[in-house]
């Protein structure tokens, strides 16, 4: 009987078994971002490629309007990398002028939105001060962890400054999730 | 019946079930790199420890000649960390001389090679400008994501400068993949 | 028969199948650290939230006294992110004074302890020189990889300086593991 241990003496029934290839999965890749109005005090969300190149969604995991839609409850591994690039950060210019120097920063947040609850939940945050002296700087922030998600939850990736995101290559900036 | 939900009313048959312990998996760790000729405009590939210490390959996932060989089609989580270390980057020396300062950089790429297609595919890239003022610097770049791979695909890790890779400890620089 | 491929012609028996939802899993999040005595030449271990907010342990994966306890043998994906923050690093002060400048560093180690042997095994290390010029700096170190663990193994996260760990938000500093 499926879901029963080999040893028949103690009938230990698990949840229904299911093939791994049937699990919701998505890997989304960066596209050029269109400037959008975002709420004050809230980081803007990135939108993503979901079907071309390395990007895909499968088994009822859908992407729509910056969100990955969670089709069934369970434990998911969720990950993202955002590569940032910019010119000399403000911090080094301020420093050279001899004024107090709160460094610039770059931040990535993976956020969960649940329709039944108005406040988004920050699942993962990667935040880094940027005080580069060189004229052009670039660097990635990587995040990944496991979360218990509910059917209907929506995931998005927010960044501190959308204009600093490197959207040139699908391997540099990406976002994914898969049911464990 | 295996592959059928418990509720017999709607006979939902999945792909064949298989035990998780039977899935192709590998975790490779750093070894000292031997200088090799690499193609111009192509980053050199690292070679790896595959059987000693924390390194292993199992269930038909094999390592040969810098490549992880994918033994069956499916969705894989692929990851790598490379720790780089070096002396003061050129960029800071140039800066001190008051000249334009394009920063040095360090880059890791996880690349897929398919025999039937001549051009490698870059799956993941982590790239960072290095403009360190201190005399000795060191830092890791971590990458990880899910990809749909085909039987026969080969994975490798390329770096911008093999001489900057920290090969001293198996926990600092590594490369792995597992079938989901 | 459970554990047998659909094609009955060659009876290929795997290990017993089991539902994914039954697998040991944990995601732990940061809490404020209490200063503790730690052994000389050994990085201090962090302690963690295991049941509030985003944190959980399930299916016999337990957390106790800074350790995640591995309840069954198998291949696990283990991950952690530690966000560090501090004031201007010593290195830049030394540099300004014109003396040799060995940079400060921040380090995260995921360590395995096996009761049968007193010497811990370092599974993963992320280490980074810190030579920031700005007065306040902050940055994450992320680690994640797959390891073969035995029932009874214990995992912990060690850091080079506990006072630099950002314990303010559960999404910034975390530690997890799940059976594949």
């Amino acid at each position: 009987l499926k879901g029963q241990e080999f040893a028949p003496s103690h009938q230990q029934v698990y949840a229904p078994l299911r093939a791994d290839g049937d699990k919701p999965r998505a890997h989304l890749t960066v596209v050029r971002q269109t400037p959008t109005q975002h709420l004050k005090n809230q980081f803007p969300a990135l939108h993503w490629e979901h079907e071309l190149g390395l990007a895909f969604t499968k088994n009822r995991m859908n992407y729509t309007n910056k969100f990955l839609l969670i089709p069934e409850s369970g434990d998911y591994f969720v990950y993202s990398q955002v590569t940032f690039r910019g010119m000399t950060s403000e911090c080094s210019e301020i420093r050279q002028a001899g004024r107090p120097n709160k460094p610039d920063s770059i931040t990535v947040v993976i956020t969960k939105v649940t329709d039944s609850y108005p406040e988004p939940t920050q699942l993962l945050m990667g935040t880094k001060s940027v005080c580069e002296v060189g004229s052009n700087w670039f660097q990635p922030i990587y995040l990944g962890a496991m979360f218990s998600l509910q059917e209907g939850d929506k995931l998005m990736v927010n960044v501190s400054d959308i204009s600093l995101v490197d959207y040139t290559k699908e391997d540099k900036t990406f976002f994914g999730a898969f049911l464990l | 019946l295996k592959g059928q939900e418990f509720a017999p009313s709607h006979q939902q048959v999945y792909a064949p079930l298989r035990a998780d312990g039977d899935k192709p998996r590998a975790h490779l760790t750093v070894v000292r790199q031997t200088p090799t000729q690499h193609l111009k405009n192509q980053f050199p590939a690292l070679h790896w420890e595959h059987e000693l210490g924390l390194a292993f390959t199992k269930n038909r996932m094999n390592y040969t000649n810098k490549f992880l060989l994918i033994p069956e089609s499916g969705d894989y989580f692929v990851y790598s960390q490379v720790t780089f270390r070096g002396m003061t980057s050129e960029c800071s020396e140039i800066r001190q001389a008051g000249r334009p300062n394009k920063p040095d950089s360090i880059t890791v790429v996880i690349t897929k090679v398919t025999d039937s297609y001549p051009e490698p595919t870059q799956l993941l890239m982590g790239t960072k400008s290095v403009c360190e003022v201190g005399s000795n610097w060191f830092q890791p770049i971590y990458l990880g994501a899910m990809f749909s791979l085909q039987e026969g695909d080969k994975l490798m890790v390329n770096v911008s400068d093999i001489s900057l890779v920290d090969y001293t400890k198996e926990d600092k620089t590594f490369f792995g993949a597992f079938l989901l | 028969l459970k554990g047998q491929e659909f094609a009955p012609s060659h009876q290929q028996v795997y290990a017993p199948l089991r539902a994914d939802g039954d697998k040991p899993r944990a995601h732990l999040t940061v809490v404020r650290q209490t200063p503790t005595q730690h052994l000389k030449n050994q990085f201090p271990a962090l302690h963690w939230e295991h049941e509030l907010g985003l944190a959980f342990t399930k299916n016999r994966m337990n957390y106790t006294n800074k350790f995640l306890l591995i309840p069954e043998s198998g291949d696990y994906f283990v991950y952690s992110q530690v966000t560090f923050r501090g004031m201007t690093s010593e290195c830049s002060e030394i540099r300004q004074a014109g003396r040799p400048n060995k940079p400060d560093s921040i380090t995260v180690v995921i360590t395995k302890v096996t009761d049968s042997y007193p010497e811990p095994t370092q599974l993963l290390m992320g280490t980074k020189s810190v030579c920031e010029v700005g007065s306040n700096w902050f940055q994450p170190i992320y680690l994640g990889a797959m390891f073969s663990l035995q029932e009874g193994d214990k995992l912990m996260v060690n850091v080079s300086d506990i006072s630099l760990v950002d314990y303010t938000k559960e999404d910034k500093t975390f530690f997890g593991a799940f059976l594949l």
Partner: antibody, heavy 119, light 106 residues
Framework: QVQLVQSGAEVKKPGASVKVSCKAS????????MNWVRQAPGQNLEWIGL????????NYNQKFKGRATLTVDTSISTAYMELSRLRSDDTAVYYC????????????WGQGTLVTVSS | EIVLTQSPDFQSVTPKEKVTITCSAS?????MHWYQQKPDQSPKLLIK???KLASGVPSRFSGSGSGTDFTLTINSLEAEDAATYYC?????????FGGGTKVEIK
């Protein structure tokens, strides 16, 4: 201190099998890979294969594949080498020997087990 | 497989004399080690990774080489150095040993 203690000498008939044990102490058993090396009387060292107790992974010298089986019992820090279908030219001293990483060489050796194959 | 050829097979040397043993590989090797084996004893690691002295080994022993050609040198032979010396490569499986060089004290 590190010790690898092997089982005692064996006399076997051609066609039989022999299983040699090697108990490790004084170091992390799963942290080192166990090799098996043999030396026929007056002859050179010959590498049979290795087993990594951490992962259970094995690698055999093709010459011994199908005849040698390497196993470990991590709960008692013991490695085993079984050689089947013994021939007279398998008469040798069999050593277990552990290595950490390949640049370290084989640092620890057992005392050896003499296996004599004779009809 | 990589074949390691040691020379000489045998050397009879007076104490305080310098001994040089060579190990030639049939293809390039990254990891070469040297072992000493005395009669009725297990081998003992002498030189690891071409040139690094193993723990407790006297400084009169040294190793050098790269690629396919490696050398073990005993700078000033002592009576206790009478033994057979083996090279071993850890670059490519199977991890082969050289044929051995027996060093005898005159």
């Amino acid at each position: 201190q590190v010790q690898l203690v092997q089982s005692g000498a064996e006399v076997k008939k051609p066609g039989a099998s022999v299983k040699v044990s090697c108990k490790a102490s004084g170091y992390s058993f799963t942290g080192y890979t166990m090799n098996w090396v043999r030396q026929a009387p007056g002859q050179n060292l010959e590498w049979i294969g290795l087993i990594n107790p951490y992962s259970g992974g094995t690698n055999y010298n093709q010459k011994f594949k199908g005849r040698a089986t390497l196993t470990v019992d991590t709960s008692i820090s013991t490695a085993y080498m079984e050689l089947s279908r013994l021939r007279s030219d398998d008469t040798a001293v069999y050593y277990c020997a552990s290595i950490y990483q390949r640049h370290d060489g084989i640092a620890y050796w057992g005392q050896g087990t003499l296996v004599t194959v004779s009809s | 497989e990589i074949v390691l050829t040691q020379s000489p097979d045998f050397q009879s040397v007076t104490p305080k004399e310098k001994v040089t043993i060579t190990c030639s590989a049939s293809s390039s090797v990254n990891y070469m080690h040297w072992y000493q084996q005395k009669p009725d004893q297990s081998p003992k690691l002498l030189i690891k990774d071409t040139s690094k002295l193993a723990s407790g080994v006297p400084s009169r022993f040294s190793g050098s080489g790269s690629g396919t050609d490696f050398t073990l040198t005993i700078n000033s032979l002592e009576a206790e150095d009478a033994a057979t010396y083996y090279c071993q490569q850890w670059s490519s499986s199977p991890y082969t040993f050289g044929g051995g060089t027996k060093v005898e004290i005159k």
